[in-house]
Amino acid sequence: AQNITARIGEPLVLKCKGAPKKPPQRLEWKLNTGRTEAWKVLSPQGGGPWDSVARVLPNGSLFLPAVGIQDEGIFRCQAMNRNGKETKSNYRVRVYQIPGKPEIVDSASELTAGVPNKVGTCVSEGSYPAGTLSWHLDGKPLVPNEKGVSVKEQTRRHPETGLFTLQSELMVTPARGGDPRPTFSCSFSPGLPRHRALRTAPIQPRVWEPVPLEEVQLVVEPEGGAVAPGGTVTLTCEVPAQPSPQIHWMKDGVPLPLPPSPVLILPEIGPQDQGTYSCVATHSSHGPQESRAVSISIIEPGEEGPTAGSVGGSGLGTLA
């Protein structure tokens, strides 16, 4: 069978080889398509309800005024010329529709390095057959499930037209110290060959480098956190990030009811002040980061100062 590719909504003419150019003609067209269950026979003198879909022209060709999805299938013509010689024509018709240019919607203006981020959703509407969407980074194809790349795809079919809408959501984990302005684009590749891909306009989100967790430093004076009763302990939370984050304090895993401050002073230490302290830095652009914990303990007279004391009460300190 000869393969024919036709665009949905366009007319199509299939020639009946060997047919006399004018009536009277002895010919018959047989269709096996989405509109038929077995073979439907159309003849030159046929004229009827099928004419809106397919009709035999005076020259014996079959005319489809506007090809639809249901016209995919096999078309056969059997013709006899004036001398009684029989000729058969056999066509396999496939249809296609090119969608509108794909678009990236819900695109991110900023990505955070080292964590998964949604870049955007690529949408293509009105294709047939469905086709595929693929993502590109700086012009090179992105492979899902490789190097922190993941793609969520969805295909929907319009209940009336039968055309497809494709959606593809891209998630990436940018490498620390990588390109600060990567270029992402998405392209639609048609399901039928010989049609070029359609590409979206590119997007260029900024990549923001967060302050690593280990950079929240907790400095304690005196060093080691062991102090004589009535002494003073100063805890300082150092975060080099700009702008300066809000610093909150924790004791024994419970937030202290104090206003934010980078310095916590524990004057006139008593048994109630003993415990494990840490600070939590909260950045406006991402989640909280906690420092290492330090243990504050009281040295009784005559004891050697330990580097870490035992956990104690629940006294409150003052802020610098």
Partner: antibody
Framework: EVQLVESGGGLVQPGGSLRLSCAAS????????MTWVRQAPGKGLEWVAS????????YYPDSVKDRFTISRDNAKNSLYLQMNSLRAEDTAVYYC????????????WGQGTLVTVSS | DIQMTQSPSSLSASVGDRVTITCRAS??????VNWFQQKPGKAPRRLIY???NLADGVPSRFSGSRSGTDFTLTISSLQPEDFATYYC?????????FGGGTKVEIK
């Protein structure tokens, strides 16, 4: 909302002529085939004529061929049936309906107009 | 020409009954059959299109089925407003042919 309104029916003598009209609204008229169907008093439904969306092709049963002519004016969203050489057996309610091809069959119908052929 | 033989020509039934009406085509018409309901003095109303599909706004108690050239309209539970005349139509070939009709009356 799809609406089809027939007019032009009435009493006519055998051998006479009558022209029926159907005003269509609520849909893109030139996208659809259109059809006339009739129903004699107390009888069933009978197909009378169909026309394709462009108006280039018309279709009739043998019972009315060469006497009736279906036509359309897509600019006016109107369908017509010119009936000549009328006979007593043409007495019926004439309905205008949307469709007539395999894509639609017949979906929406007008309320009908009565044609009486009698001397 | 294709004949559409509709049976029964009339039937009596009660509210709540299951009603079945059949049309047999004299040759293959594929899926190209519609079913209509007509009440006295009114235009026909399409119930089923392409043999098995329920038209918009038609209650789900109506259904259509097909086996070869036999087409069936079923009303699963007859309601007072369903007493009417029902017609099938083949639209695969010209002349378009209607069945003779089935009058559904109150028992």
């Amino acid at each position: 909302e799809v609406q089809l309104v027939e007019s032009g029916g009435g009493l006519v003598q055998p051998g006479g002529s009558l022209r029926l009209s159907c005003a269509a609204s609520g849909f893109t008229f030139n996208n659809y085939w259109m059809t006339w169907v009739r129903q004699a008093p107390g009888k069933g439904l009978e197909w009378v004529a169909s026309i394709d969306n462009s108006g280039d092709n018309t279709y009739y049963p043998d019972s009315v061929k060469d006497r009736f002519t279906i036509s359309r004016d897509n600019a006016k969203n109107s369908l017509y049936l010119q009936m000549n050489s009328l006979r007593a057996e043409d007495t019926a309610v004439y309905y205008c309906a949307r469709g007539g091809d395999i894509l639609v069959g017949l979906d929406y119908w007008g309320q009908g107009t009565l044609v009486t052929v009698s001397s | 020409d294709i004949q559409m033989t509709q049976s029964p020509s009339s039937l009596s039934a009660s509210v709540g009954d299951r009603v079945t009406i059949t049309c047999r085509a004299s040759q293959d018409v594929g899926i190209y059959v519609n079913w209509f309901q007509q009440k006295p003095g009114k235009a026909p109303r399409r119930l089923i299109y392409r043999a098995t599909n329920l038209a918009d706004g038609v209650p789900s108690r109506f259904s259509g089925s097909r086996s070869g050239t036999d087409f069936t309209l079923t009303i699963s539970s007859l309601q007072p407003e369903d007493f009417a005349t029902y017609y099938c139509l083949e639209f695969d070939e010209h002349p378009l042919t209607f069945g003779g009709g089935t009058k559904v009356e109150i028992k």
